[in-house]
Amino acid sequence: HSDGIFTDSYSRYRKQMAVKKYLAAVLGKRYKQRVKNK
């Protein structure tokens, strides 16, 4: 962090969670679309 107070550990964890959440949403949307098209 620019302020030097914090490690980057927690923000890294949260970024990883955000990516997983985004991918889950995208994959979920694709799956729903596939089911809809059948």
Partner: antibody, heavy 108, light 112 residues
Framework: AEGGLVKPGGSLELCCKA??????????MCWVRQAPGKGLNWIGC????????DYATWVDAQFTLSRDIDQNTGCLQLNSLTPADTAMYYC??????WGQGTLVTVSS | AQVLTQTPSSVSAAVGGTVTINCQSS???????LSWFQQKPGQPPKFLIY???KLASGVPSRFSGSGSGTQFTLTISGVQCSDAATYYC?????????????FGGGTEVVVK
């Protein structure tokens, strides 16, 4: 954050202001409570950047987190309070920097 | 929901001795995101160790952490009177599947 005595069924908002640094997108404000003589209990966290929040399952919509990045502040809204919610409430940034805590007592 | 079990709940140590505190997680914590905190009466918790084994800034080297997955350990070597406190572990989990965080029940360290 201002705590104090609240009647059962009442509401209270606790707020925490970061000083000495500015909240950024790298910061999450988390809230933890500790009943008298008991252990630490995670309540939830809110992103200073996006405002996205997540909560412990047990919270069950009783509590709500908010933040104002311009004011460098995060708040915890406590609703439908019962004596079981009597505790010291701590705010923490990324679990690294902790506030001194505020005691909330729920009693008639 | 996830559970972090800390053992023992209380431990006594002589000055200069060694204390070992265990933290067992179910399920596994996410990618070794396990932290340790020290709390003294009337004070907020103090950040000691993050990512299982990394020492926070200003924490004495007599504190060390180890472990991965479901089993973690905090060790205090050369215990000092000032180490008398309650210690907590905190796990970070895959938020999509469970709560993001859980604390262990705490371990009280008494220094003789």
């Amino acid at each position: 954050a201002e705590g104090g005595l609240v009647k059962p069924g009442g509401s209270l908002e606790l707020c925490c202001k970061a000083s000495g640094f500015s909240l950024t997108t790298s910061h999450w404000m988390c809230w933890v409570r500790q009943a008298p003589g008991k252990g630490l209990n995670w309540i939830g966290c809110i992103s200073a950047g996006s405002g996205d929040a997540d909560y412990a399952t047990w919270v069950d919509a009783q509590f709500t987190l908010s933040r104002d990045i311009d004011q460098n502040t995060g708040c915890l809204q406590l609703n439908s309070l019962t004596p079981a919610d009597t505790a010291m409430y701590y705010c923490t940034i990324n679990f690294e920097l902790w506030g001194q805590g505020t005691l909330v007592t729920v009693s008639s | 929901a996830q559970v972090l079990t800390q053992t023992p709940s209380s431990v006594s140590a002589a000055v200069g001795g060694t204390v070992t505190i265990n933290c067992q997680s179910s399920p596994s914590v996410y990618s070794s995101y396990l932290s340790w905190f020290q709390q003294k009466p009337g004070q907020p918790p103090k950040f000691l160790i993050y990512e299982a084994s990394k020492l926070a800034s200003g924490v004495p080297s007599r504190f060390s952490g180890s472990g991965s997955g479901t089993q973690f350990t905090l060790t205090i070597s050369g215990v000092q009177c000032s180490d008398a406190a309650t210690y907590y572990c905190l796990g970070a989990y895959d938020c999509g599947r469970t709560d993001c965080h859980a604390f262990g029940g705490g371990t009280e360290v008494v220094v003789k």
